[in-house]
């Protein structure tokens, strides 16, 4: 799978994580920080 950094318009897309662009799947993906979940790493869990 080809990946790259997200475009600058997606700054802030991932609330608590890193945004990566999955080129072949035509979509952005949030790699969440520890303790966060959700499509955009918007949920905190203990």
């Amino acid at each position: 799978v080809s990946i790259t950094k997200c475009n600058s318009d997606m700054n802030g897309y991932c609330l608590h994580g890193q945004c990566i662009y999955l080129v072949d799947m035509s979509q952005n993906y949030c790699r969440c920080e520890v303790g966060y979940t959700g499509v955009r790493c918007e949920h905190f869990y203990l």
């Epitope: 475009n7 600058s8 318009d9 802030g12 609330l15 035509s26 979509q27 499509v39 955009r40």
Partner: antibody
């Protein structure tokens, strides 16, 4: 199946406002950005602006600043585009477009006609 | 706002010809360019994103290339069903469409 279903065609008088809706099904708009694009008859595609429904943040093309308002209601999974002070040049098909979780998934378009 | 200059605005070619359309951005868009095909009365159809990644179901005669500010879209062998208007879109920093290229058969 993911869908963006837009409201029906509108006819408006110059100076009026129009509000076009874009209801999402099959996915949560909070996971995406919703863009709005328009196309006047026989003309090219023009990006108008977008909203991040999770945060409520909006970005608009400079030429529409102050005349367009993009909103989202996450409880109904619906985005809206309101354009005010309509003039004949605003006659166009208006599209909502999902981006973020999937690259550019388009609604069916809404024709807005501005005529006296 | 980033400007996208697309050329030519129209072209006429024969079936089987190689067709090339270019888009020039006013600043580096880091390969974040997409190409759309639009036929009369239809919504635009995404053909290519991230400069050269073909969407599922799109014929291999369509291709894209480029980097920095200069990008190219190519139809290697024009077919009658390719008659349409083609648009580039930069999506690095907000969004800007090129002016479109109307492709006709000679």
């Amino acid at each position: 199946q993911d869908q963006l279903v837009q409201s029906g065609a509108e006819v408006k008088k110059p100076g009026a406002s129009v509000k076009v809706s874009c209801k999402a099904s099959g996915f949560n708009i909070k996971d995406t950005y919703i863009q709005w694009v328009r196309q006047a008859p026989g003309q090219g595609l023009e990006w108008m602006g977008r909203i991040d429904p999770l945060r409520g943040n909006t970005k608009y093309r400079e030429k529409f600043e102050g005349r367009v308002t993009i909103t989202a209601d996450t409880s109904t999974n619906t985005a809206y585009m309101e354009l005010s002070s309509l003039r004949s040049e605003d006659t166009a098909v208006y599209y909502c477009v999902r981006s973020g979780t999937l690259f550019d998934f388009w609604g069916q378009g809404t024709l807005v006609t501005v005529s006296s | 706002d980033i400007q996208m200059t697309q050329s030519p605005s129209s072209l006429s070619a024969s079936v089987g010809d190689r067709v090339t359309i270019t888009c020039k951005a006013s600043q580096d868009i880091h390969k974040y360019i997409a190409w759309y095909q639009q036929k009369p009365g239809q919504a635009p159809r995404l053909l290519i994103q991230y400069t050269s990644t073909l969407q599922p179901g799109v014929p291999s005669r369509f291709s894209g290339s480029g980097s920095g500010t200069d990008y190219t879209f190519t139809i290697s062998s024009l077919q009658p069903e390719d008659i349409a208007t083609y648009y580039c879109l930069q999506y690095d920093n907000l969004r800007t469409f090129g002016g479109g290229t109307k492709v006709e058969i000679k």
